[in-house]
């Protein structure tokens, strides 16, 4: 009788190929050499191993690399990445953006898992900052990525990376995050002309101070109400009726529909009734 730990006669794997998918778990354990697996990792992802079989392959790699996998193995993990724990990933040193992309591809379409969050954290820490290429990659896979970072983490984003940010990447950011991002965006886009500048800076304005809003009001930007409603209340309150009228342009009529909501409500209460009446919207201060 074949001992369970011994590879049955004729089943020793000379290479990683499709025939292995028909092996039972213990056969994979007994018949696949870990070093062979490591050198032929590029083949593993092309073979439709089941979730259970991947457990065995992971176990073999863990035994071969107890201190963490080398990047040559990591970049070819493919579906095997789904089996990794955050603890496993913390042992890795991932420096190549191509490796990061390959692993994110496996998780595509799913929420950001703890494994992915750990991988990204390791990668960004290894690079020292969130550069444009990395940010481009991460927001392509996870539009909400930027807003998942703390204000402290966002402070390491260089202004040059802001060019990679799309409006939808900021949808879930809170005011504290926009406070950090806005000055970087202002710096990044400073050489653009008025209308182009406004298009780029618009989604960051939730972090803008009063003086910048006053400056924008002088540029005929026609800010929409959705953007206005995301502005910091403390930044909006000092604006005069004339400044708000210039800032919103034809959209000023939308204030009526928002008069009970912040920051419009609080701003209205700060204005003189005579000034509000000049808008002709029936706003009551």
């Amino acid at each position: 009788e074949v001992e369970k730990t011994a590879c049955p006669s004729g089943k020793k794997a000379p290479e990683i190929d499709e025939s292995l998918i028909f092996y039972k778990k213990w056969e994979l354990e007994a018949c696949v050499d870990a070093a062979l697996l490591a050198t032929q990792m590029d083949r593993v992802n092309a073979i439709p191993f089941t979730y259970e079989q991947l457990d065995v392959l992971k176990h073999k790699l863990d035994e071969l690399y107890p201190q963490g996998y080398p990047e040559s193995v990591i970049q070819h993990l493919g579906y095997l990445f789904l089996k990794m724990s955050p603890e496993d990933i913390r042992k890795w040193n991932v420096t190549s953006l191509e490796t990061l992309k390959a692993l994110l591809e496996v998780n595509k379409g799913h929420e950001m898992s703890p494994q992915v969050a750990t991988l990204i954290d390791r990668f960004v820490k290894g690079r020292g900052q969130l550069d444009k290429d990395t940010l481009d990659t991460l927001t392509a896979f996870y539009p909400g990525y930027l807003c998942s970072l703390s204000p402290e983490e966002l402070s390491s984003v260089p202004p040059s990376s802001i060019w990679a940010v799309r409006p939808q990447d900021l949808d879930t950011c809170d005011p504290r995050q926009l406070d950090v991002l806005y000055p970087k965006a202002r710096l990044a886009f400073q050489n653009m002309n008025g209308s182009e500048y406004f298009v780029k800076i618009q989604s960051f304005l939730g972090g803008a101070p009063t003086e910048d809003l006053k400056a924008l009001s002088q540029q005929n930007v026609s800010m929409d109400l959705a953007t206005f409603m995301k502005l910091r209340t403390d930044a909006v309150l000092p604006l005069t009726v004339a400044e708000v009228q210039k800032l919103l342009g034809p959209h000023v009529e939308g204030l009526k529909a928002e008069e009970r909501h912040r920051p419009v409500r609080d701003w209205i209460l700060r204005q003189r009734q005579d000034d509000l009446d000049t808008l002709g919207l029936g706003l009551q201060g």
């Epitope: 998918i21 092996y23 439709p48 089941t50 979730y51």
Partner: antibody, heavy 118, light 107 residues
């Protein structure tokens, strides 16, 4: 020719247990996983679980944990399914199937009908 | 659990026609999908393994395709003996799960 011969129909009382058998011919069950699948009248197929007869390792669908027990006897080339605390919900045809490491089910038995009735 | 959805409960076809039965997985199951035929009063029979490979003895008018989440069993030149229920199965991750089945009805 590969064949999986299952035991005959069972009529059992609620609360009782039943043990179904599945004997393979023309192949050694140790070389395969042996699965059990449930099919209720006019309903789909449900995977109960499987055993690796080589070492007795089993895996069950959560729904059948505690209800089903799968065993195998390699000397008689037979896999077994025991169902406990039977209720009318357990009235169904139960199939055994053999499969390779992929988890696919390649060959099926003819099925055993279990009727739970007082 | 991974849900396998066969949206068509019944499909009507004529002898000689070509018919495609589809199955959608609730998550990526790569190519770990099998197709099974169950004729009235009989046990299921394996037709296709690993999404596109025909089992021994299965006529070549049966072909499987797909990967990830979308899978198709195509029967070209349908014969009267193909009247049956057809089920898909995912065996990428346990618990393994079957589609609800598609009954092929010959006009």
């Amino acid at each position: 020719e590969v064949q999986l011969q299952q035991s005959g129909a069972e009529l059992v009382k609620p609360g009782a247990s039943v043990k179904l058998s599945c004997t393979a011919s023309a192949f050694n069950i140790k070389d395969y996983y042996m699965h059990w699948v449930k099919q209720r009248t006019e309903q789909g197929l449900e995977w109960i679980g499987r055993i690796d007869p080589e070492d007795g390792e089993t895996k069950y669908a959560p729904k059948f944990q505690g209800k089903a027990t799968i065993t195998a006897d390699t000397s008689s080339n037979t896999a077994y399914l025991q169902l406990s605390s039977l209720t009318s919900e357990d009235t169904a045809v139960y199939y055994c199937a053999s499969g390779s490491g992929t988890g696919a089910m390649d060959y099926w038995g003819q099925g055993t009908s279990v009727t739970v009735s007082s | 659990d991974i849900v396998m959805t066969q949206s068509q409960k019944f499909m009507s076809t004529s002898v000689g026609d070509r018919v495609s039965i589809t199955c959608k997985a609730s998550q990526n199951v790569r190519t770990a999908v099998g197709w099974y035929q169950q004729k009235p009063g009989q046990s299921p029979k394996a037709l296709i393994y690993l999404a596109s490979n025909r089992h021994t003895g299965v006529p070549d008018r049966f072909t499987g395709s797909g990967s990830g989440t979308d899978f198709t069993l195509t029967i070209s030149n349908v014969q009267s003996e193909d009247l049956a229920d057809y089920f898909c199965l995912q065996h990428w991750n346990s618990p393994y799960t079957f589609g609800g089945g598609t009954k092929l009805v010959i006009k």
